[in-house]
Amino acid sequence: TIDTKRNISAEEGGSVILQCHFSSDTAEVTQVDWKQQDQLLAIYSVDLGWHVASVFSDRVVPGPSLGLTFQSLTMNDTGEYFCTYHTYPGGIYKGRIFLKVQESSDDRNGLAQFQTAPLG
């Protein structure tokens, strides 16, 4: 089975760890695919190690473990993320995470501070 946090949030400009945990008494993991909606983020293979899709190579760092660290988040990164575990002989298992990217607290506080700052 796949165990994951179904909903996570992070700040714009920050980073987030995407993590799925697979447990089985019999099946061994051969490959893990990570996708943003339908777009490939990265793949881990027991044989080949990690490959980060060129589109995300400047923002996605493999790990920790079989998860991903997604950096320099933008509001457009809000959405569904999927981990797909290819196992042998168990087959394929999928997990889903919904990531909400929020406006950074600096931006929110900065606007408030600017509005209340004393003149002169």
Epitope: Q39, I43, L48, H51, Y88, P89
Partner: antibody, heavy 118, light 107 residues
């Protein structure tokens, strides 16, 4: 430098057999899934067979199932395609290709021509 | 089996033109879509993998987009060496299937 070199093609009569080889170098052969793809003269690309690295799982196109056998010898860094009961419609250039992550074919050999004719 | 339909089957264009080739799958294939270039007498060459990722060493004028069933290969400014035949290929499930090809010719 990654290199894939096919050999074993030639002229064979209908019903005959051939064994194609693909010698790999420049990468860890045993870590990669591999495929055979063919191209009939003046036609498009047609996948023939694949063999996975991690599980050894083998898949064939319906058009060759029961007649062709894909195999690999990791100690020799070589991929094979045993072709039996050959038909005129098997005439094509046969390419071997490396398939990282069972996803895309990133390196191809130069191809070897198989002609089935009486 | 998943059918891959490419259009157009051929096109004529001039150096510097923006060229768009489309590929449609008979069912959803997520982003399991790759694009190859083939020149006469040569082996295919990988251009784009996973629908939108540029293969190492491929010029940035090539780009891919799409997901599900509809995909596009774009050449932003056609160069003399780009005249070739282009194929899409799905790796979502076996049998792996290719589109029929798009031949890009000189106008």
């Amino acid at each position: 430098e990654v290199q894939l070199l096919e050999s074993g093609g030639g002229l064979v009569q209908p019903g005959g057999s051939l064994r194609l080889s693909c010698a790999a170098s420049g990468f860890t052969f045993s870590s990669y899934s591999m495929s055979w793809v063919r191209q009939a003269p003046g036609k498009g690309l047609e996948w023939v067979a694949s063999i996975k690295s991690s599980t050894g799982t083998i898949s064939y196109a319906d058009s060759v199932k029961g007649r062709f056998t894909i195999s690999r010898d990791n100690s020799k860094n070589t991929l094979y395609l045993q072709m039996n009961s050959l038909r005129a419609e098997d005439t094509a250039v046969y390419y071997c290709a490396r398939v990282p992550y069972d996803y895309w074919m990133d390196y191809w050999g130069q191809g070897t021509l198989v002609t089935v004719s009486s | 089996d998943i059918q891959m339909t490419q259009s157009p089957s051929s096109l004529s264009a001039s150096v510097g033109d923006r060229v768009t080739i489309t590929c449609r799958a008979s069912q959803s294939i997520s982003s399991y879509l790759n694009w190859y270039q083939q020149k006469p007498g040569k082996a295919p060459k990988l251009l784009i993998y996973a629908a939108s990722s540029l293969q190492s060493g491929v010029p940035s004028r090539f780009s891919g987009s799409g997901s599900g069933t509809d995909f596009t290969l774009t050449i932003s400014s056609l160069q003399p060496e780009d005249f070739a035949t282009y194929y899409c290929q799905q790796s979502y499930s076996t049998p792996l299937t290719f589109g029929g090809g798009t031949k890009v010719e000189i106008k």
